[in-house]
Interface confidence: low
């Protein structure tokens, strides 16, 4: 064999990974790795892993000479340590004109009055803690409710006694209830005034309401 | 190549304050974490803390707790080591140490602080 | 906190033989990932540590093949096989399994 079949250990090159090769004898050789690899002949990717700081439960991607963080989708960032703001990638998270408040790994919603849940989405059934008279019947609203009042009772809450039902009004006058205080109310026809709608009056008045 | 360039040497006087600098270059400086080393004169060092670059999160040793802040400028690539009211035992060579491998892989040259009335 | 214990404190050795050096943790530094983070550090006068070992037996970039490391659990070696003027330095071990990271206390190699 001549010279042709003579082994020069860096020639060509053994290392791989950008490593650099150093001849150490007539046989031996050494190579110079890149940070990031490792081996004989800078063949290993060093795992970057171990020991990561990726936080938050994420999970650790090795690179060369370094690592990435995949993170759970609450937290962002390199090392997962930042907090996705879900209120600005879900501009409709709350319901109900309920206000998006952002938060260390998630978000909530403060709801307007009436309405509950996390997305603000369950009306409050106000007729639960309603104190509607027994007998009356409870309507829920939002943020509010209503009392149906039976024949004979009157007010917010039912709790008054109807003063519309000894007919107080006359004269074909119609009787409301005040809902504040129970008192009747005469809504005179044309040409009635007073509280209960008996006095006559100058033609050409329109309706008048008294109060009682 | 991967470089920690740390301020000069501060001489201060007891409940002064001071803030010394670590600037990373030849890397991106996002992807390491940066730690502070403390090294009280004739002793071993000692691992104070360190902070998230990207995001400026801190973990402290629970013994420096309190003691000093860490802080970040990503714009300038530079880490920040800073006490509001310094104490004679804060004398010691602080190093900063580039995270990796789950070691300490790159360190700057030291910063030597003495605190002295 | 893990309480690394080096020894000797010191080690004079002639140039060319064997230097070792011992490094002791109070627990076990196998991580849960089933890797064992144990590190050599080399401090000259003046300089800062400079990391030889990673990870009980991984030389670092640029570091010579003399320095080696070994050991497993509780107990670690770093053997320098045969020793050089510059290797003259603070020789540091250093655990970062259990929060916090801790050094050893040191051993300094002289030449006899």
């Known amino acids: 064999a001549g010279s042709d079949s003579l082994y020069v250990p860096c020639a060509p090159s053994p290392c791989v990974n950008g490593g650099t090769c150093r001849q150490t004898g007539d046989f031996t050789f050494e190579c110079n790795c890149l940070p990031g690899f490792e081996g004989s002949t800078c063949e290993r990717n060093i795992d970057d892993c171990p020991n990561h700081r990726c936080q938050n439960g994420g999970v650790c991607v090795d690179g060369v000479n370094t690592y990435n963080c995949r993170c759970p989708p609450q937290w962002t960032g390199q090392f997962c340590t930042e907090d996705v703001d879900e209120c600005l990638l879900q501009p409709n998270a709350c319901q109900n004109g309920g206000t998006c408040a952002n938060r260390n790994g998630g978000y909530g919603c403060v709801c307007v009055n009436g309405w509950s849940g996390d997305d603000c989405s369950e009306n409050i059934d106000d007729c639960a803690f309603a104190s509607c008279t027994p007998g009356s019947t409870c309507i829920d609203r939002v943020a509010s409710f209503s009392c149906m009042c039976p024949e004979g009772k009157a007010g917010l809450l039912c709790h008054l006694d109807d003063a519309c039902i000894s007919n107080p009004c006359h004269k074909g006058a119609l009787c409301d209830t005040n809902p504040l205080n129970g008192q009747y109310i005469c809504t005179c026809p044309q040409g009635y005034k007073g509280a209960d709608c008996t006095e006559d009056v100058d033609e050409g008045n329109s309706h008048h309401h008294h109060h009682h | 190549e991967v470089q920690l360039v740390q301020s000069g040497a501060e001489v201060k006087k007891p409940g002064e304050s001071l803030k010394i600098s670590c600037k990373g270059s030849?890397?991106?400086?996002?992807?390491?974490?940066i730690h502070w080393v403390r090294q009280m004169p004739g002793k071993g060092p000692e691992w104070t803390g360190y902070?998230?670059?990207?995001?400026?999160?801190?973990k402290f040793n629970e013994k420096f707790k309190g003691q000093a802040t860490i802080s970040v400028d990503k714009s300038i690539t530079t880490a920040y080591l800073q006490w509001s009211s310094l104490k004679a035992s804060d004398t010691a060579m602080y190093y900063c140490?580039?995270?990796?491998?789950?070691?300490?892989?790159?360190w700057g040259q030291g910063t030597l602080v003495t605190v002295s009335s | 906190d893990v309480v690394m214990t080096q020894s000797p404190d010191s080690l004079a050795v002639s140039l060319g033989e064997r230097a070792t050096i011992n490094c002791r943790s109070s627990?076990?530094?196998?991580?849960?990932?089933?890797?064992?983070?144990l590190h050599w550090f080399q401090q000259k006068p003046g300089q800062p540590p400079k990391l030889l070992i990673y990870?009980?037996?991984n030389r670092f970039s640029g570091v010579p093949d003399r320095f080696s490391g070994s050991g497993s659990g509780t107990d670690f070696t770093l053997t320098i096989s045969s020793l050089q003027a510059e290797d003259v330095a603070v020789y540091y071990c250093?655990?970062?399994?259990?929060?916090?990271?801790?050094f050893g206390g040191g051993t300094k190699v002289e030449i006899k």
């Open positions: 140490a580039r995270d990796g491998a789950g070691s300490f892989t790159y």
């Open positions: 030849g890397y991106t400086f996002s992807n390491y974490v």
């Open positions: 902070i998230i670059p990207g995001s400026g999160g801190t």
């Open positions: 627990q076990s530094l196998v991580h849960s990932d089933g890797n064992t983070y």
């Open positions: 990870r009980i037996s």
């Open positions: 250093l655990q970062s399994t259990h929060f916090p990271d801790t």
